[in-house]
């Protein structure tokens, strides 16, 4: 599942990390838009292994793995992408 | 306010089952991130991570412990268990119940319980 | 497993003291890494989150460190309500593991 939202929260993530996660370990990503209380861009993403971390948003594979999702969510429904806006 | 309660047997005798509850409240175990777990702790010792529950039913166990745990859940009334099989001494300790949610920044075991004392004697 | 080695077990220090724990960790765990307070008879708490940063309300003379594969904690200045127990965890991956613990007392 990939998510975007738009938060008025502080940033999220104290560290960042570049190490590419293959596709078939990760459950969920969640994107936060740089603006509204943090400013700077931040990638979630959960693990199937109940572990989260932080993505470094310039990492070449996250970018690569980003491309593909918006694709895939504006051509078919298989990842739908949730937008939300929270006050 | 998020809160934890143990309760259990205060004593048992050795190759018995320990039973233990932990009721909460403050939030619910049916969100995506959300996790319930139990930790020891040996009186005047350190800290041992037992197991944890999460919301879509996974669960993890300390692997030195495994073949005597069960962790489980009723989500509907908030509530997490765990069962350890064929206790003897060692397994005198208090026992805290643990609140884990896959947030960033993540601080697992961010809320405990009180704890409650268990003593295996004959 | 990893194993996290936490010294000393005890200590005793006077009132304004800095005082220093440490960890060290036997595999990387990068800054997957908790220091708890336990206050006796209490249940612990989370006093430093991702090996450098302070919970919500703790005091500042409280600070985390971490130098490769070893962590500390530092009092800056020594308060009596700093009289507790210290335990690290790493969360790195399962199993979590903690620290023996350290028991802070007054000299």
């Known amino acids: 599942v990939l998510e975007v939202y738009y938060t008025s929260l502080r940033c999220r993530c104290v560290q960042e990390s570049s190490v590419f996660i293959p596709r078939r370990f990760i459950d969920r990503i969640q994107i936060l838009p740089r603006g509204n209380g943090c400013p700077r861009k931040e990638i979630i993403v959960w693990k199937k292994n109940k572990s989260i971390v932080c993505v470094d948003p310039q990492a070449e594979w996250i970018q690569r793995m980003m491309e593909v999702l918006r694709k895939r969510s504006s051509s078919t429904l298989p990842v739908p992408v949730f937008k939300r806006k929270i006050p | 306010q998020v809160t934890l309660k143990e309760s259990g047997p205060e004593i048992l005798q050795p190759s018995q089952t320990l039973s233990l509850t932990c009721t909460f409240s403050?939030?619910?175990?049916?969100?995506?991130?959300?996790?319930v777990g139990w930790i020891r702790q040996p009186s005047g010792k350190g800290l041992e991570w037992l197991a944890n529950?999460?919301?879509?039913?996974?669960?993890y166990y300390n692997p030195s412990l495994i073949n005597r745990l069960t962790i489980s859940k009723d989500t509907s009334n908030n509530q997490a268990f765990l069962k350890i099989t064929n206790v003897d001494t060692t397994d005198s300790a208090t026992y805290y119940c643990?609140?884990?949610?896959?947030?960033?920044?993540?601080?697992?075991?961010?809320?405990w319980g009180q704890g409650v004392m268990v003593t295996v004697s004959s | 497993d990893i194993q996290m080695t936490q010294s000393p077990s005890s200590m005793s220090a006077s009132l304004g003291d800095r005082v220093t724990i440490t960890c060290q960790a036997s595999?990387?765990?990068?800054?997957?890494l908790i220091w708890f307070q336990q206050k006796p008879g209490k249940s612990p708490r989370p006093l430093i989150y991702?090996?450098?940063n302070l919970a919500n309300g703790v005091p500042s003379r409280f600070s985390g460190r971490r130098s490769e594969s070893n962590y500390s904690l530092t009092i800056s200045s020594l308060e009596s309500e700093d009289m507790a127990d210290y335990h690290c965890?790493?969360?790195?991956?399962?199993?979590?593991?903690f620290g023996a613990g350290t028991k802070l007392e007054l000299k």
């Open positions: 991702y090996a450098t």
């Open positions: 643990v609140r884990s949610e896959l947030v960033m920044p993540y601080v697992p075991f961010d809320y």
């Open positions: 595999q990387d765990i990068g800054n997957d």
């Open positions: 529950i999460w919301w879509d039913d996974d669960k």
């Open positions: 403050g939030f619910s175990l049916s969100p995506y991130g959300m996790g």
């Open positions: 965890l790493q969360f790195k991956q399962y199993p979590y593991t």
